[in-house]
């Protein structure tokens, strides 16, 4: 048994490759720091998408050259990834981490299946 | 298998210092603050203080009692925390443990003695 | 800073549940965190955030947390649970640790 962390099953990417899912989680107590990660699980491969460690009250801050943005609002972590393509479907686990005060805590989503679709290119056209 | 594991404990005179070590591995050690908590004799549990990770520019905190006198510091590179005890008392003499809360070291005696 | 408020000693017969209080003011809006000591070995963290367990710790230890007394119990007990037990919040007003002042934990 662990931290409970909810995200939604399905979530389709826009037209412009960017998908946004709301991931959740519930621990008693308020934690002062907590680290977000984005795990990408596919064909039995998890690699890690992106991360960021965000003091509560403050905003998620991912790296500059991070494909994901987000906002935070107490125990809740509104995630947002950009850039993907048809080959980036998969499934998207939102990993959670109590890391102040002690002792340390942790919790793993079930994942968001994100569905991306290329766009069609538009046909030449005479207009 | 996590580690924690103190070692630099002792016979001391009061008055004199001490310094503990506290070696980890095997988890995110440069992640999480350090604390040390000792045990004196047929007492319970005290909390001394600790060291915060670098996320929190490894500030440092202590409880009343050995404000002053102890001193906690880190080094994340070598996965290691020290505890530096100064003016050591008699009312010292304890097993001294450091933790992260969810893994404890083994604890190391600390005797202040004349 | 809170005071958490500890039996100094509870008794239990082997099989038995073993209850173990924790009393603080509204202690229920705290995590309350549960460490088993031995005599000659380390602390271990028996129960974590009210009611969770770290692997490796038995299915018998469990925890709850509700108004002014967090509590941790201990079913089908047996010898080898004799040990202090503490109780621990984190002070939010000074960023600082506190523990509960131990329950020496009987088999008869």
């Known amino acids: 048994k662990a931290m409970h962390v909810a995200q939604p099953a399905v979530v389709l990417a826009n037209s412009r490759g960017t998908a946004s899912f709301v991931c959740e989680y519930a621990s008693p107590g308020k934690a002062t720091e907590v680290r977000v990660t984005v795990l990408r699980q596919a064909d039995s491969q998890v690699t890690e998408v992106c991360a960021a460690t965000y003091m509560m009250g403050n905003e998620l801050t991912f790296l500059d050259d991070s494909i994901c943005t987000g906002t935070s609002s107490g125990n809740q972590v509104n995630l947002t990834i950009q850039g993907l393509r048809a080959m980036d479907t998969g499934l998207y686990i939102c990993k959670v981490e109590l890391m102040y005060p002690p002792p340390y805590y942790m919790g793993i989503g079930n994942g968001t299946q994100i569905y991306v679709i290329d766009p069609e290119p538009c046909p030449d056209s005479d207009f | 298998e996590v580690q924690l594991v103190e070692s630099g404990g002792g016979l001391v005179q009061p008055g004199r210092s001490l310094r503990l070590s506290c070696r980890g591995s095997?988890?995110?050690?440069?992640?999480?603050?350090i604390s040390w908590v000792r045990q004196a004799p047929g007492k319970g549990l005290e909390w001394l203080g600790f060291?915060?990770?670098?996320?929190?520019?490894?500030?440092?905190d202590y409880v009343a009692s050995v404000k002053g006198r102890f001193t906690i510091s880190r080094d994340d590179s070598k996965f290691i925390a020290w505890l530096q005890m100064d003016s050591l008392k008699t009312d010292d003499t304890a097993v001294y443990y450091c933790?992260?809360?969810?893994?404890w070291g083994q604890g190391t005696l600390v005797t202040v003695s004349s | 800073q809170p005071v958490l408020t500890q039996p100094p000693s509870v008794s239990v017969a082997p099989g038995k549940t073993a209850r173990i209080s924790c009393g603080g003011n509204?202690?229920?809006?705290?995590?309350v965190h549960w460490y088993q000591k031995k005599p000659g070995q380390a602390p271990v963290l028996v129960i974590y955030?009210?009611?969770d367990r770290p692997s490796g710790i038995p299915e018998r230890f469990s925890g709850s947390n509700s108004g002014n007394t967090a509590t941790l119990r201990i079913s089908r007990v047996d010898a080898g649970d004799e040990a202090d037990y503490y109780c621990q919040v984190w002070d939010r007003t000074t960023d600082q640790p506190v523990f509960g002042g131990g329950t020496k934990l009987t088999v008869l």
């Open positions: 095997n988890f995110n050690f440069d992640d999480l603050a």
């Open positions: 060291v915060r990770s670098k996320a929190y520019g490894e500030t440092t």
């Open positions: 955030y009210d009611s």
């Open positions: 509204n202690i229920a809006s705290e995590a």
């Open positions: 933790t992260t809360f969810n893994y």
